[in-house]
Every structure is written in C-alpha cells, then in structure tokens.
Amino acid sequence: ECVTQLLKDTCFEGGDITTVFTPSAKYCQVVCTYHPRCLLFTFTAESPSEDPTRWFTCVLKDSVTETLPRVNRTAAISGYSFKQCSHQISACNKDIYVDLDMKGINYNSSVAKSAQECQERCTDDVHCHFFTYATRQFPSLEHRNICLLKHTQTGTPTRITKLDKVVSGFSLKSCALSNLACIRDIFPNTVFADSNIDSVMAPDAFVCGRICTHHPGCLFFTFFSQEWPKESQRNLCLLKTSESGLPSTRIKKSKALSGFSLQSCRHSIPVFCHSSFYHDTDFLGEELDIVAAKSHEACQKLCTNAVRCQFFTYTPAQASCNEGKGKCYLKLSSNGSPTKILHGRGGISGYTLRLCKMDNECTTKIKPRIVGGTASVRGEWPWQVTLHTTSPTQRHLCGGSIIGNQWILTAAHCFYGVESPKILRVYSGILNQSEIKEDTSFFGVQEIIIHDQYKMAESGYDIALLKLETTVNYTDSQRPICLPSKGDRNVIYTDCWVTGWGYRKLRDKIQNTLQKAKIPLVTNEECQKRYRGHKITHKMICAGYREGGKDACKGDSGGPLSCKHNEVWHLVGITSWGEGCAQRERPGVYTNVVEYVDWILEKTQAV
C-alpha cells in the first residue's frame, strides 16, 4: 500500500538498516526510496528537546511485514518509501537549505556570485554531490561568497549542522541539468585500471553500467563477462572512480568490458530498469519466497508486485509436473544485486520492474504534412499529438509532442490568432483525423507558455509549452518522448523522422492519416549556405535531402523531429520553418530542443 504522507512526532521502532543525514524529512523519504532495502524511515528534525547531534538523522529501516511499531517522539518524522507507490519517482532536489552546513569532503573551494552559481558549478562537476555556500552576510570576511563543492561515499552528508549565513543544496545532475558529457559507449576488451569503490555481481555490462549510474561514487566501471578466465571474477562489476573523473589507464583484456556512469544522461535512458531476462542463469541471494508460476514473465510480475523482492530465478516445470507451472524464487540482498551468478543450471533470471518507475517513462521501448512521406501505423509515434482550435470552427492547427504527463511541447508560431487556451484541444493516441468526433476525449489546455524571446520563427525561439488541464495516463498509444540530454550535444543522430498531418505539397490540405518521413540531419554550416538571407543559429537544427522530395510542410508545425539513439527515441527538433516544402537544397529548419532543455525544465518544474 502506498502511503505518501509523513507522520509527525512519530518514530518507527526497530528495523534499522543504516543512518544517513538529510536536510529534510522529504529528502529522507527519497533516500529511503532509492535504497535497495529501505521501506520505512524515521527522520529527526531540529528541536530544542533533541540532542543536536541527532538533528537531521535519517534512519533507514526494513521490515518483513512492511511496517513497524510506532512510538511517539517529539521532533521525529516518519514515513514510508515510495517503493510501494506506482507513481513516477525522481531524485531531483532543487531545494536550497538556509543556515545549514552539509558536511562532506570539501574538495573544491572557489568564489561564486550566488548560491545558484554554486549549485550550477556542483551540477557540472563530476565528483560533486552537494555544496555549501557562504553568503555575503557570512561573518568571516575571507569566507564570504565561497562555494564549497563536496562529496561523500554515500552521496549524502556525513553530518548536518546549523550555521548562520550559509546555504546548502544538492547537485542537480538527477534533474537532467548537467552539462557533463553523456558517454553511452561500452568498450569491449577493455579494463579500466583505477581504484574500485565497490563491486557487485551483474549478468551483463549494461546492468553493470546502470548500477554504476545510480551508485553515488561511481564514475566508470569494468565488467568481467562469464567467459572471463578467472572463475571467481566472472560476472563481477567493478565500480570505479579517479581524481580526474576519467580512467587513468585502459588495459586491453579479452572478455572484459568497460564504460562510464550515465548520470549525465539518466533522464533519457533507463538506468534503474533492468528489464531483460537471463536464460540459463541463476541469481543467488536471500530467499524471500518460492511460488508456482506459469512462465518467467509471470515470475517477474510476482517479483515486481512483492515490494521486498529485488530479483528472481525461475525454474521451468519438468514435463507435466505441477500443472505445467515452474518454481519462482523471489530473492533479495543487501545491495539489490545477486550475491552470486551461476550459469548452466537451466534457470531464467531477472530483476524486479518496480524500479522502472524511477526511470523516465519516455525510455520505455515502443512498438516498433510530410512530403514524400508514408502513412504511420497506430502506436508508432505515441508522443505525437494533434492540436486543434475550436474557433471559428474546429480544425487541426499544429502537431505537438507529449514530454510529461501534463505537458506538450510545440512551436510558438502555432498560436497566431489564439486569443485564449480555452479554444484549444489536444488529442493524443490519434492515427486518423477522422477518428475525432464530437464525443472524442481530449485534453483541455490550462496554459500556453511561449518563449519570451520568440518574435518570428525565422529568428528562433520558436518553442512553446502547453500545460494540460488533466494528466495523461500513459498507454501504448500515448506516452512521452525523451528530451535530448545536454550531455548529448555531440551525438550524431542518424535515424531521424518527421511526423505530422500536414500538407503533402505546398498547395494541399491536412492529411487524414499521420504521415512519417525519414530525413537526414544537415549540419548548421551546410544549412546556413542554403539560407544566406537568414541567420541559422545553434538554437536551430536542419534536416532534409539535398535533392528535396521529403520534408515537413504546412500543418506539421510544432510536431516532432524524433531521432532514435541507443534504442531510445529523443525529441531532437520541433518543426518550425523552411522555404517552401521539400524544395531542392532547402532543408527544413527545426527548433533545436537540446538548447532549450533548461528552459523546458524551468517551466515544467516550476512550483
């Protein structure tokens, strides 16, 4: 059962796993949620009745029954982890804590104009977990405006104390706001020879990389595959760090793979969700339960629904035994990973999908006017919406993309003549415009947010957000697309598609069926040559064939330029402008979404 509210002046008795320090009960709840075993917690707030050394302690707890006895205690705040909840979870914490000094290893000290600048510095520093900033009112003159970047083994402070005229806060890496490079490559036959901060067992290098990503100290990893010569090290995932933040030495070794933490791209690729099945593989760990199950998929479901289950091994039924049901072993460990991985015993293993809700929904794999385009199939572009105006009569106005359960990203120029959001309707999960009848359900628009600097599409800033009146329930036919990672600025996308119901030629009409066209990206230098009378800025991105023939056109505006990278679709562009449609040497010009990620997050995460 999901319990989100906090219990004031209440302490849970027993069940202690570990104690950390957090600046608030709210953040203690987040830490508990992300801990592999924590189900409940007790936080101690600052209070004259409490020993100051106990202030800000966050005791993480576990219980076989998923609850613990409650005791009244002033200044104690208790609650449950969000593991039991089905809603999306985020570790993003933008709060600034006034008059609190969060202790850790102070590894960098510099002058900063503001706490915000200090937080940005922390976010863009590979080692930084949190910071403390001495304001200009700080008593000690030489410490004023000093920004201390800090890290710890756990990612949380080692202690928190009251200190006047300082502010503290966390890195915003988990808010997708880091400019650090996102290196997704896994390097075969490579060992990174740097200090290990931890080691876990993993079935493959991808899981190892994801574990590295949500380990607070891991910057890169080395994984020894099951073919690794040294038997005791097979399936070993070594979590590593270095002072520079990069591997100091790369050693060529067969059957080893290495890679980097994905912390700078974690909002746009799955890092918690290990959804694969591992055949002929047994995961060892503490046994939670053994249940009969029809298949390994059913076993995974059972594990996902059991809040304490972290991973499982399924042994298929022998011939006609037990009505064809096999045994499903639900398991757990102290760190969420198997204690040992064995091969050749016929088991099928995997992980709970409960952690998938910690990943952005947009990373979920989907079922596999556009000039020169072809018709799409249902569910092919589940983030594509059709934006309608009802004034003076109802008609398709523009395309748009679902980027959150209450947010549509589109183009600013779509709102010419729109006097109020009341006249707008957003339809999702639509393939044919003819599906839209009077009684077809739609999302009303609560607010239109147009970029302050938008004047005309050709000058840039052609971007707008629609805040919906109600939330979108994600299904196979309506789900979000990932925003590109700021750390992905240098990625060369090769699989890009433009979609929409727009014209198929310059003088035409809105199409009934959603059209799609695969279109290559064009460099900004090349694009500038094609548009000499315009300024193609870095905030624009171009796509088109030199010979023309395929392009977006009138009515496609605001829709997505979607690019698939590492099996995840990213919203790389918003259809904006171009000379004519599909003309030779006149590429389409799109709003370059990566350059607006900060703006999007600022607007969508505003309190």
């Epitope: 183009a411 120029h413 709102f415 003549g417 006097e419 004047k455 050709e458 402008w577």
Partner: antibody
Framework: QVQLKESGPGLVQPSQTLSLTCTVS????????LHWIRQPPGKGLEWMGL???????SYNSRLKSRLSITRDTSKSQVFLKMSGLQTEDTATYYC????????????WGQGTLVTVSS | DVVLTQTPGSLSVTLGDPASMSCRSS???????????LEWYLQKSGQSPQLLIY???NRFSGVPDRFAGSGSGTDFTLKISRVEPEDLGVYYC?????????FGSGTKLEIN
C-alpha cells in the same frame, strides 16, 4: 479586465518632441507585445512600432530615426517619444495589444489626439 | 517595406447586397513557418479599429459568418455576403509577415 489608455499633450509645437504614455491594466507587459499606431484626421492607419514583451523594439522604417519606444514594467507603462514634429504628425495615436503572439490586435486604447501647431 | 494596396478606395453598396474588396501586397505574405500574417480590421466612425479576420481567412470569434477572407501570396480579398448597417466604416488590411508591419490604405464602405 484588459484596458489600455493613451495620455500625453494635446498640443505640441513644431520641431518639438512628442511624449506619449500608454498605461495598461489587466495584463503584464512582460507577457504581451504592445504596438503604437497613428491615424491623421480623415486618413488611414499607420503602424509606428512595437515593444516586444522581452524588451526589444521594432520601428516603422520611415519613422525610425525620430522614434523611440521604452517601457516601465513596474508601472505597466509604455512610452513613445518622437522628435522633430511637423504638422503632418498631427494624428490620433493609439496603443494596441496583440493576442498570444504580436498580432492580431485584440485590444486598443481609445486613442489620444495630438495636434502639431504653433 | 511591404506596401499594401487596397482597392477600391471606397465602395457604395445597397443594404443586403454583397460587397468585395481587395488587398494586394508588394511581396508574398506567406511566412516560412506556414502562416500568412494577413489581417482585416474594420474602423467604424469615431471608434478604434476592431479585428475581423486573421491569417487570411480565419474569422475572429464573434464576427458574423457573412464576412469571409480569402487569397494567398500577394492577393487577398474580403467579401461580405449581405451588407448590414453595422458593417459601414473603413476596412484596413494589415500584414505582420515582414518587419516592419504595414497597413493598407483602407476601403470605405458606404450605403448607396
């Protein structure tokens, strides 16, 4: 509700500078674009310029050299200054607000008549 | 700058009859974003102008359906299917595709 009101001197000497104020209510100048438009007696409308909501300005190229549009967002006011006035600048001066984008003009002030005469 | 030429300068019609006026632009008003930023305004005697049509053919809310805008590129037309007494005044076309924006010279609609 949305209101725009132009104010300024009814009479200006030739060669002097005209200063007009458009005071708005019911919306913020940082959310909407504001235009100045004029109309000489018995003649047509002439678009003079606009204050974009981000603080940038655009001007009618014929008037650009003598025109300046500024604002004070805290007072919800946009100002028009035009130098070197001649008798042909005698007109009713309107301020107008766009919809979500710069145009179409959805709201207009009632206009203020400025006479250039010695 | 874009010059908008409106014809005729004045138009005398009988109430209940149709009326048609033209607005010709010195450059195409089709924007590269797919919109055509061409609008029609009516100014009645002693009043501020009021919006009738935006984007060539879209009637603003509350505008009677006897008003219809059409055209593309450089040639635009405003038609009134049956002129009513409240339709009298001066009609202006206006373009916001090219900066600086410009008004047409106006067409005065009078009663016969």
């Amino acid at each position: 509700q949305v209101q725009l009101k132009e104010s300024g001197p009814g009479l200006v000497q030739p060669s002097q500078t005209l200063s007009l104020t458009c005071t708005v209510s019911g919306f913020s100048l940082t959310s909407y674009h504001l235009h100045w438009i004029r109309q000489p007696p018995g003649k047509g409308l002439e678009w003079m310029g606009l204050m974009w909501r981000d603080g940038d300005t655009s001007y009618n190229s014929r008037l650009k050299s003598r025109l300046s549009i500024t604002r004070d967002t805290s007072k919800s006011q946009v100002f028009l200054k035009m130098s070197g006035l001649q008798t042909e600048d005698t007109a009713t001066y309107y301020c107008a607000r766009g919809m979500t984008l710069a145009t179409p003009f959805l709201y207009w002030g009632q206009g203020t008549l400025v006479t250039v005469s010695s | 700058d874009v010059v908008l030429t409106q014809t005729p300068g004045s138009l005398s019609v009988t109430l209940g009859d149709p009326a048609s006026m033209s607005c010709r632009s010195s450059q195409s008003l089709e924007s590269s974003d797919g919109n055509t930023y061409l609008e029609w305004y009516l100014q009645k005697s002693g009043q501020s102008p009021q919006l009738l049509i935006y984007g060539v053919s879209n009637r603003f809310s509350g505008v009677p359906d006897r008003f219809a805008g059409s055209g593309s590129g450089t040639d635009f037309t405003l038609k009134i299917s049956r002129v009513e007494p409240e339709d009298l005044g001066v009609y202006y076309c206006f373009q916001a595709t090219r900066d600086p924006f410009t008004f047409g010279s106006g067409t005065k609609l009078e009663i016969n």
